[in-house]
Interface confidence: low
């Protein structure tokens, strides 16, 4: 809920890459007694869906009639703050994030509905909403207290890899079983048959009446 009244053309924001033991919470957790500039509100806790989607509202009390607003989502975890996504929009227009952004959002008056996608358990952390009134001057900055987003990886139901292994094992077992069965059956069949003579097929006398001509095969051995 930080507020800043620097004019836009008289200030520059620098998000330092270094981190300090004294975290951003020192900066965020004090009650804004003299805050006449801008107040940003966001829910304290949000639980992400099983599909890794979390939505929350970021609401700011605009001290003036801003026409250009920039919204940034920051993530704080283990005293490190990283920018998750950012979007600039004109009041009354859609909130447009970059194509490759994991964020989507819609704006309605002084409210911004933010949705963060593709979250995993490791992404659990404090997600801070930062709102900047870019135009017209003066420039204002508001920083929310942050929304603690909890992400729980869904339980495997059951593990698809495990299922594949079972399927592979069963398939292999059935294949070898059928192969073995076929082999055994063939060997039994072959044992039952009389031994074959190698050499000449003898021309057999006709067993049927002469009228029904039947041609017997000849086997010509190759020396």
């Amino acid at each position: 809920m930080a507020c800043l009244g620097f004019q836009r053309h008289k200030a520059q924001l620098n998000l330092a890459t270094r981190t300090w033991p004294c975290t951003l919470l020192f900066f965020l957790l004090f009650i804004p007694v003299f805050c006449k500039a801008m107040h940003v509100a966001q829910p304290a806790v949000v639980l992400a869906s099983s599909r890794g989607i979390a939505s929350f509202v970021c609401e700011y009390a605009s001290p003036g009639k801003a026409t250009e607003v920039r919204v940034t989502v920051l993530r704080q975890a283990d005293s490190q703050v990283t920018e998750v996504c950012a979007a600039t929009y004109m009041m009354g227009n859609e909130l447009t994030f970059l194509d490759d952004s994991i964020c989507t959002g819609t704006s309605s008056g002084n409210q911004v509905n933010l949705t963060i996608q593709g979250l995993r358990a490791m992404d659990t952390g404090l997600y801070i909403c930062k709102v900047e009134l870019m135009y017209p001057p003066p420039y204002y900055l508001g920083i929310g207290n942050g929304t603690q987003i909890y992400v729980i990886d869904p339980e495997p139901c059951p593990d698809s890899d495990f299922l594949l292994w079972i399927l592979a094992a069963v398939s292999s077992g059935l294949f070898f079983y059928s192969f073995l069965l076929t082999a055994v059956s063939l060997s039994k069949m072959l044992k039952k048959r009389s031994p074959l003579t190698t050499g000449v097929y003898v021309k057999m006398p006709p067993t049927e009446p002469e009228c029904e001509k039947q041609f017997q095969p000849y086997f010509i051995p190759i020396n």
Partner: nanobody, 124 residues
């Protein structure tokens, strides 16, 4: 009551450098920074640093020349002033806002605590 003690002021030639220090007597809260007031002019914000050190703000007139930093172990903030100009001549005040959240280059009322100031003179 938080006491802010500035040091490092003095005279310097244009293009020179100075380093101001400010050590609060105890924890000073959300943010600390520097304001300055030139003779016959209003006080203006120079630079601000959040207590975490993650965020800094600079007035356009000093951007790229001044650097605000802090040493959390010593509980001290610094203003490194390089490439100084005659228009940087002013009384420099260390400020702290333990609870206040409205800080403005034009409106210094958001700062609860002010130092006595240290004079900086830049001659051409």
């Amino acid at each position: 009551q938080v006491q802010l003690q500035e040091s490092g002021g003095g005279s310097v030639q244009a293009g020179g450098s100075l380093r101001l220090s400010c050590a609060p007597s105890r924890y000073s809260g959300a943010l600390m920074g520097w304001f300055r007031q030139a003779p016959g002019k209003e006080r203006e914000g120079v630079a601000v640093i959040s207590r975490s050190g993650l965020t800094t703000y600079y007035a356009d007139s000093v951007k790229g020349r001044f650097t605000i930093s802090q040493d959390t172990a010593k509980n001290t903030i610094y203003l490194q002033m390089n490439s100084m100009k005659p228009e940087d001549t002013a009384m420099y005040y260390c400020v702290a806002a333990p609870e206040a959240r409205a800080w403005s280059s034009r409106d210094p009322t958001g700062y609860n605590y002010w130092g006595q100031g240290t004079q900086v003179t830049v001659s051409s």
